[in-house]
Every structure is written in C-alpha cells, then in structure tokens.
C-alpha cells in the first residue's frame, strides 16, 4: 500500500481552478526527492505534466504550478483554466513515475455554468454583490415587478416594485427598473450571505401573461490562499474587496474558534497587543484595496486570517472577505537576531539587521514604527547617505559586518527612543525584521565631554574614557557624516582616572585635531568594536569659533558645555522614491503632522546640498528632538 495520500475524486467546472494536495511521510529523503503529477494513459503509462524539478508540460504552460511544503510532508498542484479535456485519471507521486510511491486521483471537469433550462446561474463570493437581470415584454412594462426565492416548495417574496422588502434582505437589496428603452429590471443584492444561495424567480406582471425568469444563485465561501513564510520574516496580506466597500471600515482578523475572528488590526484604530510594533495597515486605494504587513513572524502567528469590510471594523455576516492560511516555516533562512535591545539613557545601542545575502547591493533602511492610526514606519536612515534631520550626529547605518547583516548605531539615547524599529531593504520584502529598543536605568560606560568648542587654527584634544570591561575591544574615534563614521587617528594616553574600582586596564584615548578649520566642525564618536561588530559609542559635538587667545585646547570632562536643548524646525519632508521600496506608501512621511517634532525633517536635497556649517548647526540645535 502506497504511503502517498490525496483526494480520490476531484470535481470542478470549466474555467475554474483546482488545488490538489498530496501527502507523503515527511522523512528526510521524501522531503527532497522529486515530486510529480502525471496523467495516466490508456496503456498504463503515466505522462508527467509537472514536477518539482521545474518541468512543465506544454499542456500546462502558464496555468499550473507544483509547490512542495517539506515541513508538512505535502505538495500542492494548482491547475487553472480547466477544460473538459482535463478530465481523466492522474497520479501524484514521489521519485520516478513508474515506482509505487503514488496516489491515484480522478479529475472530472464538467461544463461551466450557463443557461440551464432557461435558468441563469450566478456564482458570487460571500459578502460580494450580485445583480440579477430580469427581462420583460412591453405589455408588462407598467406592471408590478417582483423577485421570489424558492424555499422548499413555496416561492417567498423577496422584493417588489411597490416597495416591499423581505426582512432577511433589509438594507442590502434594491430593485432597479431600467430606462424606458430597455425592457429589463434588475435586483441588486449586497453583502451576500451563504443563506442567500438558492433558486430565485423574477416576474413582471401577476397574471397569466406575466414574464418569468429563473435564476440560480450560488454563494461561494472564499477558499483560503496558502501562504508559507519564514519564522522571523514578514508576510503581506493584499486585500482587494472591490470598490463598493471603498468607504467601509476594513479589518484583518485571525480565526480562533467557531465563528470567532479576533481583530488583528482595523482602520478604526484597533490593534491586537500581540502585533504591537510589527504590523502596518497600508493606506487603502480608491478601489478599496489595502494590505497588511506583519514582520517578526512567530510560530504562534500561524493560522487562518480573514480580511474584510464592515462598518464595525470586524467580521459580521455579509462582510465581503478574503482568506489566507498562514504557515510559519521554522526551518527559517532568516537568522536569529535579538528582538529586544536595551540601552542606557545617554549611551547607545548597536542593532544588527539581517538581509538576504544574495542582495548585498540592495539599499538598506531603518525606520521607526509608529502606532498612531493604522501604523506607519517613517524612515530614519538609509545606506545611500540619507539621515532624518533630527537624527544627524547620532544615527548611522553601516554595511558592516556584511554577508547578510548590516549594523545600525543610535547614540545619545533618551527615553523617547524607546520603541519598535524595522530593518528592511529595497529587495526581498520577506526579510523585514523588527527590534524593540528599551531604555534602561544606568550610566554610560564611555565618558566624553559634552559639547566642545575648538578655535580656528589651534589644536584640540578630546578625551574618551573607556572602562576596563572594554580592555579587549578595539577603541576608535571617528567623524560622523550622513554616509557613516570615518575613522580618525587617536592616541592611547594610558589608564583613565575617570572610573572608581577600575584597574590599569581602563583607558583614556584622545582625538587630536591639529590646526582646526571650519571643516572640523561636526559630530565625533568614540566607540568600541570587535572586528566588524560594534559596541557602545559616545558622541561629542565640536563647534569651531574664531581665535580669541593663542594656544591649544585640551578639553577635560569638567569643562564640557551642555548641549543646548533648542527646537529648530527644518521645512520639507522626506518622500521615498518608488524605486526604493516596493510600496512607498508604507514608509513615506505624511505632510500633515500634528506634532512639530515630526516636521523637523529635512528633504534629501537639503541634506545633500547644505554646507557643513549648516548641517552641523542644525544638528547641534535639534539633535535631541525626534
């Protein structure tokens, strides 16, 4: 007896699609061996139509695919545009066609719906709209028009032209009589329910000369689309419910038990706590379609999801819906990375972001998830040299360590930096990942002066004190710019005296700027790293002023200026190019922003073209605001 199992009989109609699932024991060998779908010939052979190794017969070109789901021990054969010629006996199997590892499937394709005994067949999805057309003759033009539903042996009036509406259809049905030129009336039923299915009779007139027309309404449940995504990755549900619900509240829910469908997110502002920080409901198009992105997929996210439209923002009878069955693949290609990174106020975090290593040339992005309204994720930094204005001097995206990981460093942390951040690229959208930054109590490990003023033409020495815990780390100074942080020569001045209970392994490493020029103004970072992996950083703003008295400046921790806490707004806003991200609306800034902090966002033009003084000055004034 073959261990392969599937549907013995499949019945469908012309023009339709079938999706045939075949089950196999998920042993290591079976998972990776060839899967096939073949048609049995009269003389016993079985001719391959499609296989997992890429072969597709000309008979199936452009209308069939075979997908293997190794975790579950299943493979699925999808065949579209069925014709009666597709009727026959098939096998789904593993290995070689002639071997016994197969299962027999009978496919029967019957004639498509049409006029059967003068009955018009209407096949419509649950929640959608149907228009039943009813022709009549001139002599019945002025007479009563009506639609009946056959319930058992009896016709029950549904609607008529005198204004009657059956209570089961209240608020979702209308009868339209076309202009005088057309001898036709229509009945439009919205928000179709499964119970609406059945035989209908439309009638013009009430006597023996009345015109009658039969209609068969079939209401289909939406078949969940199978979606198979990697653990820690991302999924996008595209929901197209039709223009008739363009102005109705939209929702995505997850089925729990029975008819319960727990709202995951809706356009009325509801969001399930389990999805906080990792979900966005995309702005909807004029046609009512929208999409929902969920990142940082977890094992428990697997399940059946429905999207729909209803004024309540949740599933109700008659909601037009679309369905998905999400499977989360635990043999993920997306590497583990911390989902929570903790940083001390005043210090820094270094976040490692995974990306598809096949896409090393893709543009890398980092954005801050905002929960307001339906969620959005405005960009903060990218790998092409753009940094949101309020983050100048304290945020850097580095291509290191490379080979599938980039690094984002954020320093000068405040409690306002706590939140969810997304790592993404303009390549594979499945590789969007989420990290939560938490701000904790404590003291920064690196000690640097506050903001420093250098004198033109003089020498400036800026100290950075490293505690002994960093003795094995490489210590560096660099100058921040919007493409990264360029390393600078520094001097090890021996043990630091800035730490209590710290032995000779503590270090004072100084940055020396000789013959200071205007170009030296800006942000400088000292930090630690191990190879290409970055640790803590500390930032110092160096301002440059005219000479007052001769000599060099050696800045100590005590002499440091406090950074002024002023708000300076930049005009303009950041718009993401279409080429950069597949759906730019997910990340584009909105022009109307309630909080002035969000308006302090320079456009790319102002960042690229401004002089170093302008950039430095503006950074200096509002680096605390974001």
């Amino acid at each position: 007896k073959s261990p392969i199992f599937g549907p013995e009989e499949v019945n469908s109609v012309e023009g339709n699609s079938v999706s045939i699932t075949c089950y196999y024991p998920p042993t290591s060998v079976n998972r990776h061996t060839r899967k096939y779908w073949c048609r049995q010939g009269a003389r016993g052979g079985c001719i391959t139509l499609i296989s997992s190794e890429g072969y597709v017969s000309s008979k199936y070109a452009g209308r069939a695919n075979l997908t293997n789901f190794p975790e579950n021990g299943t493979f699925v054969v999808n065949i579209a545009q069925l014709s009666q010629d597709d009727s026959g006996r098939y096998k789904c199997g593993l290995g070689i066609n002639s071997r016994g590892l197969s299962f027999d499937v009978s496919l029967e394709v019957s004639q498509g719906p049409g006029l059967l005994n003068d009955t018009k067949v209407y096949t419509v999805d649950l929640g959608r709209t149907v228009t039943i057309n009813c022709p009549f003759k001139t002599e019945n033009a002025q007479k009563r028009k009506s639609l009946y539903k056959q319930i058992g042996l009896y016709p029950v009036l549904v609607i008529d032209s005198s204004g009657y509406v059956n209570p089961n259809y209240t608020g979702r049905i209308r009868l339209d009589i076309q202009g005088t030129g057309q001898l036709l009336f229509s009945v439009v039923i919205n928000q179709l329910r499964l119970s609406d299915a059945g035989q209908y009779l439309c009638q013009a007139g009430d006597d023996s000369n009345s015109n009658k027309k039969n209609a068969d309404l079939q209401v289909l449940k939406p078949e969940p689309e199978l979606v198979y995504e990697d653990l820690r990755g991302s999924v996008t549900f595209h929901c197209a419910l039709g223009p008739e619900v363009a102005n109705v509240a939209k929702f995505l829910c997850r089925q729990s038990s029975g008819e319960n469908c727990d709202v995951v997110v809706n356009t009325l502002g509801k969001r399930a706590p389990a999805f906080e920080g990792r979900i966005l409901l995309n702005p909807q198009d004029k046609d009512g379609s929208f999409s929902v992105v969920i990142t940082g997929l977890r094992k428990e996210d697997a399940g059946r999801y429905l999207c729909g439209a209803h004024s309540d923002g949740q599933l109700q009878e008659g909601s037009p819906i679309q369905a998905w069955q999400l499977f989360v693949n635990e043999e993920s290609t997306i590497p583990r990375s911390p989902t929570v990174v903790k940083g001390v106020a005043g210090s820094s975090v270094a976040v490692l972001c995974p990306y598809n290593r096949k896409e090393s040339k893709s543009i890398k992005y980092w954005c801050l998830w905002e929960g307001a309204q339906n969620g959005r994720c405005p960009l903060l930094v990218d790998s092409e040299g753009w940094v949101k204005a309020q983050y100048e001097g304290r945020l850097s995206l580095l291509e290191e360590p490379g080979n599938g990981t980039f690094t984002v460093i954020l320093n000068q942390l405040t409690s306002r930096d706590a939140g969810f951040y997304w790592c993404l690229t303009n390549g594979d959208t499945l590789w969007r990942t989420t990290v939560e930054i938490k701000i904790i109590e404590g003291e920064p490990n690196l000690k640097v002066p506050g903001n420093v003023t250098a004198v033109l033409g003089e020498t400036l020495k800026v100290p950075c004190h490293f505690p002994c815990k960093f003795s094995s780390y490489e210590k560096y100074w660099c100058k921040w710019n919007n493409t990264g942080c360029q390393a600078l020569p520094s001097q090890d001045e021996g043990p630091s005296k800035a730490f209590v209970n710290c032995d000779e392994n503590s270090r004072l490493v100084s940055l020396t700027l000789n013959l200071v020029t205007r170009a030296d103004e800006g942000w400088y970072w000292c930090g630690v790293k191990q190879g290409h992996f970055y640790g803590e950083t500390a930032a110092v703003y160096v301002a440059v002023e005219e000479r007052k008295a001769a000599g060099s400046r050696d800045v100590s921790l005590a002499k440091a200026d406090a950074a002024p806490d002023e708000k300076v707004l930049d005009s303009g806003f950041r718009e993401i190019e279409n080429k950069a991200i597949q759906d730019p609306r997910l990340f584009a800034e909105e022009k109307a922003v309630a909080d002035t902090r969000d308006q302090a966002d320079g456009s790319r033009a102002s960042v690229d073209s401004g002089s170093s003084e302008e950039q430095g000055g503006s950074s200096r004034h509002h680096h605390h605001h974001h």
Epitope: P113, K221, S257
Partner: nanobody, 127 residues
Framework: EVQLVESGGGVVQAEDSLRLSCAAP????????MGWFRQAPGKEREFVAA??????????YYGDSVKGRFTVSGDNAKNTLDLQMKGLKPEDTAVYYC??????????????????WGQGTQVTVSS
C-alpha cells in the same frame, strides 16, 4: 459555539445500505472541509472519508477500507455532510463521528488534524 450533530445510525444486516448525515450550523465562514471518522470498541479512531470545497471544485477523500463502497457528499454553504454506505460488513460496526475544519497542513487521516467533532452515532452491522 460550534456543534456538529450526526444522525442516521442504526442496526442493519450485512450487505445492507445506510445513510449518515451531519449538520454543523455554527461552523466558521471560511470552513470548507468536513469528514467522517469511526471508532470500534478497543480500537483507535479511523479515517473513513472527507470532502473539501474550493470555489466550484469539490475534493473527496476515502480511507482504504471503504473505497468503492462509501460515498461522501455535502453542501458547503449549508455546512451539511452525508455518508452513503453500501455493502456494509460486520467490521464496519463502530461509532461514526462527523468532523470539521481540519488544519490545512495536517494529514486528514489523522484525527488530531481536525478542530471540531460531533458526539457520534452508532452503526451496528450484524451478520
């Protein structure tokens, strides 16, 4: 609350026929799979047959021991399920359970893959 209610069980002679029915009024909108299992005294629950709907397509699955003798049918919109049993044998004696809404990725033949169950109806085939 989802309730699956079986009917049609009884006592018949070998080679007779019997038709079982199942109604599942509370099933979720998107449920599109229903099936039959049976359990004889002292034995594990065994897969009998299942039916799935997708759009205008219908998929029928059968257990090895009933192929060619039993026919599964149903109405997706009404959440009803029938099992026409012909050529009954004494070894078909069991409690027959209606099941609904399996895990999309589970093997339909395993009872653990199904979410909802009826209370069962007894079928006894005497020789």
């Amino acid at each position: 609350e989802v309730q699956l209610v079986e009917s049609g069980g009884g006592v018949v002679q070998a080679e007779d026929s019997l038709r079982l029915s199942c109604a599942a009024p509370g099933l979720p909108f998107s449920s599109s799979r229903m099936g039959w299992f049976r359990q004889a005294p002292g034995k594990e629950r065994e897969f009998v047959a299942a039916i799935g709907w997708s759009g205008r397509s219908t998929y029928r699955y059968y257990g090895d021991s009933v192929k060619g003798r039993f026919t599964v049918s149903g109405d997706n919109a009404k959440n009803t399920l029938d099992l026409q049993m012909k050529g009954l044998k004494p070894e078909d004696t069991a409690v027959y359970y209606c099941a609904a809404d399996p895990d999309y990725y589970g093997d339909y033949r395993t009872s653990g893959a199904w979410r909802y169950w009826g209370q069962g109806t007894q079928v006894t085939v005497s020789s």
